[in-house]
Amino acid sequence: VLPAKPENISCIFYYEENFTCTWSPEKEASYTWYKVKRTYSYGYKSDICSTDNSTRGNHASCSFLPPTITNPDNYTIQVEAQNADGIMKSDITYWNLDAIMKIEPPEIFSVKSVLGIKRMLQIKWIRPVLAPHSSTLKYTLRFRTINSAYWMEVNFTKEDIDRDETYNLTELQAFTEYVMTLRCAPAESMFWSGWSQEKVGTTEEEAPYGLDLWRVLKPAMVDGRRPVQLMWKKATGAPVLEKALGYNIWYFPENNTNLTETVNTTNQTHELYLGGKTYWVYVVSYNSLGESPVATLRIPALNEKTFQCIEAMQACLTQDQLVVEWQSSAPEVDTWMVEWFPDVDSEPSSFSWESVSQARNWTIQKDELKPLWCYNISVYPVLRDRVGQPYSTQAYVQEGIPSAGPVTQADSIGVKTVTITWKEIPKSKRNGFIKNYTIFYQAEDGKEFSKTVNSNILQYRLESLTRRTSYSLQVMASTNAGGTNGTKINFKTLSISHHHHHHHHHH
């Protein structure tokens, strides 16, 4: 049977190394050898490249080597497959070397900022040695911030034939480390070089970018002063490397700038004690190059009525995120402040907050929150300088079974009844939302019964027990992940009710 017609011929010119063509089929059933016929020097010359089954094992590839690789040039390539039954020729294919040339990657030797030019890096590289000297090269420069996985790209061409070339990458973030890699190709070629080795550079530092500012209003003290916990952090979008030397805070009662007070701190939080009026608070960060723009916050008067616009809120889990969504009756509100902290019996050690704009949802990666911990999440609407009533919810990113079951006791033991009381499990041991409680009870050598009640019930009266019988009992608290039994208790029903016994005595 004749060999299959060679098809899908694909050729690539590795500059000053070889001209290689591949084709299909890659494997023939019977002993097959291939002859690749080439015309070159614009059709003036021709030669062949042979693969032999015995030595190359049906290898559907053949390479032409220097010195017969001329550039620029147009080649024709035709593959002949031959076996014992005959020859099958491919169609003739036409190749312009400029269009299929692959060269070595360039070598970046420096990525530096230029003194006095902000948000720019100058990349210097050496053009590949193995590249046609006179041809225009096109380049792709890939860059990303050092802690990002997302590459950005910029394309450009260079016509000059300097060995040492430069490109100024602008509109970067200040004081940020960038990773760079570069590839190139002759302008007409469809084949790019590999990527150069990565090189890192840092943009120049600037005055701080800005601050996000928030507060926690605490109840007024006996003397009427209000503690206000101020907190701030680098604004979203600020350079990762940005460091402030310190922060200046100034504040005053509304319409009374004469009473301005100032504070300087190196912390990112500060407690103020304010009167009952409305106050304005301003914070700037500074470094050796200057100050950030001012962050402003209005602290409402103690008796001010705050607006309410959040009507409902849902927290739901995706595979790797916690998503909180809310509905609002005020379409003009498009900024929200989200607070979240663990719901623990003691004062929360970690308190987090984040601003949300032009959205009515907030997302956090699950791995930023601890599993088995309950988080309080509050959303405040912010309309210009006014902060509205928060709406709060609770969420777990992962539930588990409770670490301990309920502590249980039997009260009011009767002849056929008993009242069981149990305590709520401490927050730190719940590991999830308690869905329900199940009371398991069993007479000595008898069948086990159970009764499930809602999570808001902490007491239950069991009836229809057998008189003068020993019972064992335990209460299980359940979350979505499963249940945990409390300590087992024993009690014995009475033989005669106290009430009945008393009555008889009086007779």
Epitope: G43, Q78, E80
Partner: antibody, heavy 117, light 112 residues
């Protein structure tokens, strides 16, 4: 329309020189190898010389090496053949031909060169 | 270097089929493409077959080319001979030893 027009032929004495020209039109001259092919009266075709696109490479049959020089002027789209030390066996019709990718795809009408005393 | 040998003449009657062989003296006939040219008296040659068996679009499909490695030769076949086919036919290939084209001696086709 591709056209190749030869000129410069005629009668010349043995040992003397002659220069043939070929004016090309209708295509990008600088993209093609070009050739001179001759045909002695009542004889077959015989390749004489070829030249690369930029003129940097030239090729000759053995019998004319050192006597004939092929050249081109891409700006004028013209091919030349300088023939020195002419011999009677150089008598022939000289054709200017374009090397296509796989064959001589265009030929001129030819110009007669007679070498005789 | 090699030579390409053709018969001096071939004849065939009108509407018949003829084949003109072109034998390569050394080296493999398949190593370089073979082209065929037709030349009418007093006219420049025109190509009728290139790359062994390819036909330019303007040439009649009565013309076909082939190569045969066993006889180390190429062949031009013309079917349904016409009076206008009467001409000289030359085979041509590339010789890497002389770095140039080689023509066969030519075959005069007479249509009877």
């Amino acid at each position: 329309e591709v056209q190749l027009v030869e000129s410069g032929g005629g009668l010349v004495q043995p040992g003397r020189s002659m220069k043939l020209s070929c004016a090309a039109s209708g295509f990008t001259f600088s993209n093609y190898y070009m050739a001179w092919v001759r045909q002695a009266p009542t004889k077959g075709l015989e390749w004489v010389a070829s030249i690369s696109t930029g003129g940097g490479n030239t090729y000759y049959r053995d019998s004319v090496k050192g006597r004939f020089t092929i050249s081109r002027d891409n700006a004028k789209s013209t091919l030349y053949l300088q023939m020195d030390s002419l011999r009677s066996e150089d008598t022939a019709t000289y054709y200017c031909a374009r090397h296509g990718t796989l064959y001589f795809d265009y030929w001129g009408q030819g110009v007669m060169v007679t070498v005789s005393s | 270097q090699f030579t390409l040998t053709q018969p001096k003449s071939v004849s065939g009657s009108l509407r018949s089929t003829i084949t003109i062989p072109c034998e390569r003296s050394s080296g493999d006939i398949g190593d370089s493409y073979v082209s065929w040219y037709q030349q009418h008296l007093g006219r420049p040659p025109i190509n009728v077959i290139y790359a062994d068996d390819q036909r330019p679009s303007e040439v009649s499909d009565r013309f076909s080319g082939s190569i045969d490695s066993s006889s180390n030769s190429a062949s031009l076949t013309i079917t349904n001979l016409q009076m206008d086919d009467e001409a000289d036919y030359f085979c041509q290939s590339y010789d890497s030893n002389i770095d140039g084209p080689v023509f066969g001696g030519g075959t005069k086709l007479t249509v009877l």
